[in-house]
């Protein structure tokens, strides 16, 4: 009976949770179509949870197209960050609610807040402005929403998501999630990937900033801009470490920092836990 | 373990009604899309319907649009096919199935005859 | 909307290498499903997205897809290998499609 059933249970290679997918569509291969535009469009990945840039020809393809990565995420990608939503009420804090105030190397003194283990609370410090830890929010409400116990036993989950005691139900909250820090790397890793102007098909690899990986692109032999990479490993050291964003659950994340206003709505958009 | 078990199936006249279900377990049911799925004896598989997991939007075969309507009650983890205005050609054994956006369907239960004759 | 077209049956002496395939227009532009049904058993999914694998499926099953055709490779084959397959798609307005089946023969 086991054996059969253990047939029946389908666990991808890279242990991926349920998909909870906010349209079927988002599940389609993108499609390029048959015609020989180069536009650049996004897809969501159904293997890696993200949303990723792909060529599009211009006409047919399907609807797993989408003109900005931002809408591509309001499509496909709500309720697929594998979100740890709190089932008890006494759940634990994200592992970087007990790591020490980190003022970092950097000689700026901004105002941030961190969770204090000792007393329980969110407090003030200042911080350099660049490295430290993840225990590091721009508001003290911020702080409180992902490390502190909520009042009458709620508990916040990293998502603004807010599980009721009394039937379990979930309250959206408009809550931030932890801000962005700041690129260090060579300028040309938030550069596009360009083709160039010639024929040839060279595999070569691009640092793709908005979801912080290397990725392949075909360059045509000539032309296009310093973000081009004969290897993954030469992409990832050239640009990799340059990028460092905070997540609320399961470590660091590269992405490239966008304009103080647009902060908050990226920073919840592109999270994804790492252990996806 | 994760488990589908479909029920209802059973005999009924051309022009009548049957409503099937299928109990999930094992999975949190409502984070899946859910499909019916049919075969005709000696035949192949032939896809009736699908809901989704969030939207709980339905789509439908052709074959049956108009007639059959599927829905899910996340709270009982159970999935339903109403069939309505049977027909000679929807017998079949019908399966429900735990399905990936529309892809794949990777749980499937063992299955419920529905016999339609006069 | 896709057809998909199988072969209906396929014949492989034991230990050889079994390939069914599944064509239908465009058929690489989308991902493609295989399953395995033995006699009075429910279907089994034995690939995924073109070519993945379930856990507990065994790894002489591969899939591949291209052009207008999807393959499912069985390497090595084996008599419990015997059953029907069936390939399956979707299409853009959110049908799941399957082909018509292959019946595999272990000789």
């Known amino acids: 009976d086991s054996e059969e059933d253990e047939e029946h249970t389908i666990i991808t290679d890279t242990e991926l949770p349920p998909l909870k997918l906010m349209h079927s569509f988002c599940a389609f291969k993108a499609d390029d179509g048959p015609c020989k535009a180069i536009m650049k469009r996004f897809f969501f990945n159904i293997f890696t949870r993200q949303c990723e840039e792909f060529i599009y020809g211009g006409c047919e393809g399907n609807q797993n197209r989408f003109e900005s990565l931002e809408e591509c995420k309001k499509m496909c990608t709500r309720d697929n960050a594998n979100r740890i939503i709190k089932t008890t009420l006494q759940q634990e804090k994200p592992d970087f609610c007990f790591l020490e105030e980190d003022p970092g190397i950097c000689r700026g003194y901004i105002t941030r807040y961190f969770y204090n283990n000792q007393t329980k609370q969110c407090e003030r410090f200042k911080y350099g402005g660049c490295l430290g830890n993840m225990n590091n929010f721009e508001t003290l409400e911020e702080c409180k929403n992902i490390c502190e116990d909520g009042p009458n036993g709620f508990q916040v989950d990293n998502y603004g998501t807010q599980l009721n005691a009394v039937n379990n139900s979930l309250t959206p909250q408009s809550t931030k999630v932890p801000s962005l820090f700041e690129f260090h790397g060579p300028s040309w890793c938030l550069t596009p990937a360009d083709r160039g102007l010639c024929r040839a098909n060279e595999n070569r690899f691009y640092y793709n900033s908005v979801i912080g990986k290397c990725r392949p692109f075909k360059y045509s032999g000539c032309g296009g801009n310093e973000n081009n990479f004969t290897s993954k490993q030469e992409c990832l050291r050239a640009c990799k470490k340059g990028f460092i964003q905070r997540i609320s659950k399961g470590g660091l994340i590269k992405t490239k920092r966008k304009r103080k206003k647009q902060r908050v709505k990226i920073a919840y958009e592109e999270i994804f836990v790492k252990n996806m | 373990q994760v488990q589908l078990v479909e029920s209802g199936g059973g005999l009924v006249q051309p022009g009548g009604s049957l409503r099937l279900s299928c109990a999930a377990s094992g999975f949190t049911f409502n984070d899946y899309a859910m499909s019916w799925v049919r075969q005709a004896p000696g035949k192949g598989l032939e896809w009736v319907s699908l809901?989704?997991?969030?939207?709980?939007?339905?789509y439908y075969a052709d074959s049956v649009k108009g007639r059959f309507t599927i829905s899910r009650d996340n709270s009982k983890n159970t999935l339903y096919l109403q069939m309505n205005s049977l027909r000679a050609e929807d017998t079949a054994v019908y399966y429900c199935?735990?399905?990936?956006?529309?892809?794949?369907?990777?749980?499937w239960g063992q299955g419920t005859l529905v016999t339609v004759s006069s | 909307d896709i057809e998909l077209t199988q072969p209906p049956s396929v014949s492989v002496a034991p230990g050889q290498t079994a390939r069914i395939s599944c064509s239908g227009d465009a058929l690489g532009s989308k991902y493609v499903s295989w399953y395995q049904q033995k006699p009075g058993q429910a279907p089994v999914l034995v690939i995924y997205?073109?070519?993945k694998r379930p856990s507990g499926i065994p790894e002489r099953f591969s899939g591949s897809n291209s052009g207008n055709t999807a393959t499912l490779t069985i390497s090595g084959t084996q008599a419990e290998d015997e059953a029907d397959y069936y390939c399956?798609?979707?299409?853009?307005?959110?049908?799941?499609?399957f082909g018509g089946g292959t019946k595999l023969t272990v000789l």
């Open positions: 199935a735990r399905t990936i956006g529309v892809l794949w369907d990777d749980v």
């Open positions: 399956q798609s979707y299409t853009y307005s959110l049908n799941q499609v």
């Open positions: 997205g073109d070519n």
């Open positions: 809901i989704e997991s969030v939207s709980s939007s339905t």
